[in-house]
């Protein structure tokens, strides 16, 4: 039950996180005009990964896309790439995790396969979250650098008579959305990985011991109700009575010095 809850919660948290990463990537407010030196501006500038916008105090907003690819800063391209990779990995992770959910039955899918899929999606979510956090952090670092550079030459003009105030940009809402979303995706991924451990059985060193009696044989597997904490693929926690020397739900059998025949 705890495993199902952890897996379900991990899925929901990751879903919210990836939705946030998509939202952040699409948002226009990655950087917003710093109003500290000009709080009474009648024109407000803000920029996203895909376009820059100007909102006039009259209420009119004009946005212009970055219609060039080669003319854009390499850092901006890198941020775009990180966010897109994060979205793609997250989307694939979501698709995989849907099929991995313990509460969803798909044909005769083995629990071992679900465990593997849960682990895969968990890793994808972790990488997706890291991509988003990295992308947002790179952009934030770029902003901080540019902010202090523009502060250094804030006012230029002729003999101090005419002031040209250089527009400085600070953190926009999208950065905070991106950081939170990336964090949520990361947490969701970790939860999926933890759930995977619970879904998979522990490999035991004790193999099935066969007791041959006249009439019919019973194979008894010790620890048939053991807790599922390992990364092994046997998830059918039940006693087997099949009369054979091997249990039918052993997927892999490794020789061991503790094997008894």
């Amino acid at each position: 039950m705890a495993v199902t809850a952890c897996q379900g919660l991990g899925f929901v948290v990751s879903l919210i996180g990836i939705a946030g990463i998509i939202a952040a990537t699409c948002m226009d407010q990655w950087s917003t005009q710093d109003l500290y030196n000009n709080p009474v501006t009648a024109v407000f500038n803000y920029q996203g990964l895909w376009r820059s916008c100007v909102r006039e105090s009259s209420g009119f907003t004009e946005c212009r896309g970055y219609f060039t690819l080669l003319g854009l800063p390499a850092m901006l391209q890198a941020v775009r790439a990180l966010m897109i990779v994060g979205i793609v990995l997250g989307a694939i992770g979501l698709l995989v995790s849907i099929f991995a959910l313990k509460c969803i039955r798909i044909g005769s899918m083995e629990d071992s396969a679900k465990a593997n899929m849960t682990l895969t999606s968990g890793i994808m979510f972790i990488v997706s979250g890291l991509c988003a956090i990295a992308g947002v952090s790179v952009f934030a670092n770029m902003l901080v650098t540019n902010f202090w550079m523009s502060t250094a030459n804030m006012y230029t003009g002729m003999g101090g008579m005419v002031q040209t105030v250089q527009t400085r940009y600070t953190f926009g809402a999208a950065l905070f959305v991106g950081w939170v979303a990336g964090g949520l995706t990361l947490i969701g991924g970790v939860m999926m990985c933890i759930a995977c451990r619970g879904l998979a059985p522990e490999e035991t060193n004790y193999k099935a011991v066969s007791y041959h009696a006249s009439g019919h044989s019973v194979a008894y597997k010790p620890g048939g109700f053991k807790a599922s904490t390992g990364f092994g693929s046997n998830t059918k926690n039940k006693k087997i009575y099949d009369g054979g020397a091997r249990t039918e739900d052993e997927v892999q059998s490794y020789p061991s010095k503790h094997d008894y025949v």
Epitope: V40, A42, Y46, Q47, S52, S57, S58, V165
Partner: antibody, heavy 118, light 113 residues
Framework: QVQLVQSGAEVKKPGASVKVSCKAS????????MNWVRQAPGQGLEWIGQ????????KYNGNFKGRVTITADTSASTAYMELSSLRSEDTAVYFC???????????WGQGTLVTVSS | DIVMTQSPDSLAVSLGERATINCKSS????????????LTWYQQKPGQPPKLLIY???TRDSGVPDRFSGSGSGTDFTLTISSLQAEDVAVYYC?????????FGGGTKVEIK
Amino acid sequence: QVQLVQSGAEVKKPGASVKVSCKASGYAFSNYWMNWVRQAPGQGLEWIGQIYPGNGDTKYNGNFKGRVTITADTSASTAYMELSSLRSEDTAVYFCARYYRGNCFDYWGQGTLVTVSS
Amino acid sequence: DIVMTQSPDSLAVSLGERATINCKSSQSLLNSGNQKNYLTWYQQKPGQPPKLLIYWASTRDSGVPDRFSGSGSGTDFTLTISSLQAEDVAVYYCQNAYTYPLTFGGGTKVEIK
């Protein structure tokens, strides 16, 4: 077509208050900022302040030191400008004007002459 | 506050001749975000409210004759009437539309010589 119709001329004593109205028609009143601008006889234009009728947000020119209050009644599509503690130098024609793209005033009222005289 | 200075105070031009009005702002009106200059020009005839001519320093409002043109960037702007007509006799004002408080120039009176 867009029309801004202002209230009639007023004569006030120093220290009194005046409230000028501006009725808008021909557009969505709540969606555009309404500005007030004044012009003293033979002088230039001076911006007083503005209101966004949609949410009542206002901005004022600091030169009026809290003497001015701009309000709007969306149900009547009317904006109001009240100026208190009147002085003789407040004698002017007061205009309302719609705020438009480029932060310009594209439509103006006909003006209201406010005379402050003892 | 941004101070708008217009020159000359008055201008007498013959009909059909070019009239040029200058406007200087104490601070740049160029917005880096869209590379537009937030300067507006108005025409005011006696006994009438001002009429919008040009916004964004060079964009003519609808219905404004093409003999009116605006130019300039940053702090220095010009309104040009390429061929003065009798109906162009008026006072012309420039306005800072970039920073609050919104401020106007002192005006330039255009007359016929």
